[in-house]
């Protein structure tokens, strides 16, 4: 039957000290690997992999490393300066064998525009991806390569959630055996037919992606098929079958009360860490309300956080949480009105969420300032928009066009915001830098590993 | 290089009329479209109309359509505004651009003429 099925590939999320001062507070970054692993599962649950169905993730173990950990010996990940291949070596140095995939996520602007890498799993010999136990290989390290790591920084700036996690599906796709997408089936982005274009590129694009294209959460056909391939071979090695919550993990699951981790990561005074006896463990301990593992709104004390007090910071498009006073969970926030600009006025809030270009709020559309001969470079990281369906009609806020709508103002796109098609991003010189794919590949073939390790490592 | 000077602005009461003119100095007046923008204090720059290279297209901001008229003399290299029915919300420094094409961003701005409509 299906629910005796091994389809749920285990994970363990590790975070350096950058993503934490970033985030703040453990129970922030808790929140964002959950949101991670959320968006993810959401994809691959409801892709079909040429007949396998259903696949889930769900973490198995968290390591949070502080600022306090910065200093710490035995933390791999406390060095300021690291480039994106070294990241993904240290974090492959550990032996990650009881894990289907382990991540790093990090704060840290990569050169060149990098999101991620990580390693590409294969139906057959070892090379990496899911379920890949720790060994020796010939630069004479053991090394786990069923690891991937990503940053939520792009030239100085911070990634939309949406877009770190198709990030995060796309590193996690490369683990699954699947490549670039490459080809005019699985490009449609690239395509020169408006109405291909419009739906973006898949999740294993090689180049950039914006995140609200009704394509750039979805597999295409080429992933599905590589995917299924590796799925068949690897997943009995090491998934299991889904259902019970993991106690330890820090993520409050169904059938658990709270989690605050295991022994040494509980600093918790109400609830029952992971290490404690079957009918206590993760449960709050007696006459306690809450625990701060539940939700923002509980206080250190095990009671809820009164009825005024705030639990989410207002933000461009929504307005400050508030607690009720009755629950550990910080309510939803009240949208800010739809077309209120957002994200330095490049965008406008719809529903609650930066997701809209400012050119939605005069009937237009976004669309790429470039020029066939290449001329207009300089334009290739302004806001441009075109009436609906108009690419003739593409031209720059700042332009003459659009005066009544902009007053004559150049509108700038933010660094680490997806340029001239989707091909780069903006730095802080408003350049449109183009993304080398496979840079991190090739300085790896120049480093120490034997050389069939190249062929199974992407961003 | 196009220099663009403006004049014609001052105090006027509300219901008067004022003709603000912007001369170009250069050969190549023609092959510019000409815009007028202005700035209220402590306000953002705003549009008010721009003309393309002939003459033959003009876009007005909503705010002043059916009270101002933008035209121009490409034999005199210059673009005017005729502004009629002034309310106190006109007040404003009024300055003209110029542009190459109608694409292209504004690349060149005059110093701008300081326009004052009291009740």
């Known amino acids: 039957t299906t629910s005796a099925e091994k389809n749920t590939c285990q994970l363990y999320i590790q975070t350096d000290h950058l993503f934490f001062k970033y985030y703040g507070t453990r129970e922030a970054v808790i929140a964002q690997i959950s949101s991670h692993v959320k968006a993810i599962d959401t994809i691959y649950q409801t892709t079909d992999f040429s007949g396998i169905r259903n696949i889930s993730f769900m973490v198995k173990r968290i390591r949070i490393n502080t600022t306090a950990d910065e200093k710490d010996p035995t933390n791999p990940f406390r060095f300021p300066n690291i480039g994106v291949e070294k990241f993904l070596e240290l974090n492959s140095e550990q032996n990650h064998d009881d894990y289907c995939l382990a991540y790093v996520f990090t704060d840290r602007d990569f050169d060149d525009g990098v999101l991620g890498l990580a390693w590409v799993g294969a139906p057959s010999g070892s090379s990496g991806g899911i379920c890949e136990k720790s060994k020796l290989y010939s630069d004479g390290k053991k090394k786990s390569l069923n690891t991937g790591i990503i940053t939520v920084q792009n030239y100085g700036s911070h990634v939309p959630p949406k877009v770190s996690h198709i990030t995060f599906a796309h590193e996690v796709g490369h683990n699954f055996g699947s490549p670039h997408d490459s080809g005019t089936e699985c490009t449609p982005g690239e395509s020169k037919n408006l109405g291909q274009k419009e739906n973006g590129n898949y999740i294993m694009y090689a180049r950039a992606t914006s995140g609200d294209k009704l394509n750039n959460n979805k597999f295409s056909l080429c992933s599905i098929r590589n995917i299924s391939q590796v799925l068949e071979k690897k997943r009995n090695n090491c998934f299991v079958e889904s259902g019970q919550p993991i106690c330890g993990n820090g993520m409050v699951e169904q059938g658990e009360e709270c989690d605050c981790g295991y022994s040494d990561q509980c600093k918790d005074e109400c609830c029952f860490d992971a290490n404690q006896p079957e009918g206590r463990k993760c449960k709050l301990k007696p006459g306690k309300q809450c625990s701060p593992s539940q939700g923002p709104c509980c206080t250190a004390q095990c009671a809820f956080k009164s009825k005024s007090e705030k639990c989410r910071d207002d933000s461009d498009c929504a307005r400050e949480g508030i607690c009720n006073g009755f629950t550990a969970l910080c309510p939803a926030s009240d949208p800010k009105p739809n077309f209120t600009d957002c994200n330095r006025h490049t965008q406008v809030c719809i529903n609650g969420q930066c997701a809209g270009s400012i050119c939605e709020k005069y009937g237009l559309e976004e669309c790429t300032c470039a020029s066939s001969d290449g001329k207009d470079d300089k334009e290739l990281c302004h806001v441009c928009c075109m009436k609906k369906m108009d690419p003739s009609t593409c031209a720059s806020t700042g332009s003459v066009q659009w005066s009544r709508h902009f007053s004559g103002r150049t509108i700038t796109l933010q660094p680490g915001s997806p340029c001239n098609d989707f091909r780069g991003y903006c730095d802080v010189f408003m350049r449109c830098r183009l993304v080398d794919a496979d840079g991190p590949l090739a300085r790896l073939k120049k480093a120490i590993f034997s050389p069939e390790l190249y062929e199974n490592i992407a961003e | 290089e196009v220099q663009l000077v403006e004049s014609g602005g001052g105090l006027v009461q509300a219901g008067d009329s004022l003709r603000l003119s912007c001369a170009a100095s250069?050969?190549?007046?023609?092959?510019?479209?000409m815009g007028w923008f202005r700035q209220a204090p402590g306000k953002e720059r705003e549009f008010v109309a721009h003309?393309?290279?002939?003459?033959?297209?003009?876009e007005y901001a909503d705010s002043v359509k059916g009270r101002f008229t933008i035209t121009r003399d490409n034999a005199g290299n210059t673009v005017y505004l005729q502004m009629n029915s002034l309310k106190p919300e006109d007040t404003g420094v009024y300055c003209c651009?110029?542009?190459?094409?109608?694409?292209?961003?504004?690349?060149?701005w005059g110093q701008g003429t300081q326009v004052t409509v009291s009740s």
């Open positions: 003309i393309s290279l002939s003459g033959g297209n003009t």
């Open positions: 250069g050969r190549t007046f023609s092959s510019y479209y």
């Open positions: 651009a110029a542009s190459p094409s109608l694409r292209s961003a504004w690349q060149y």
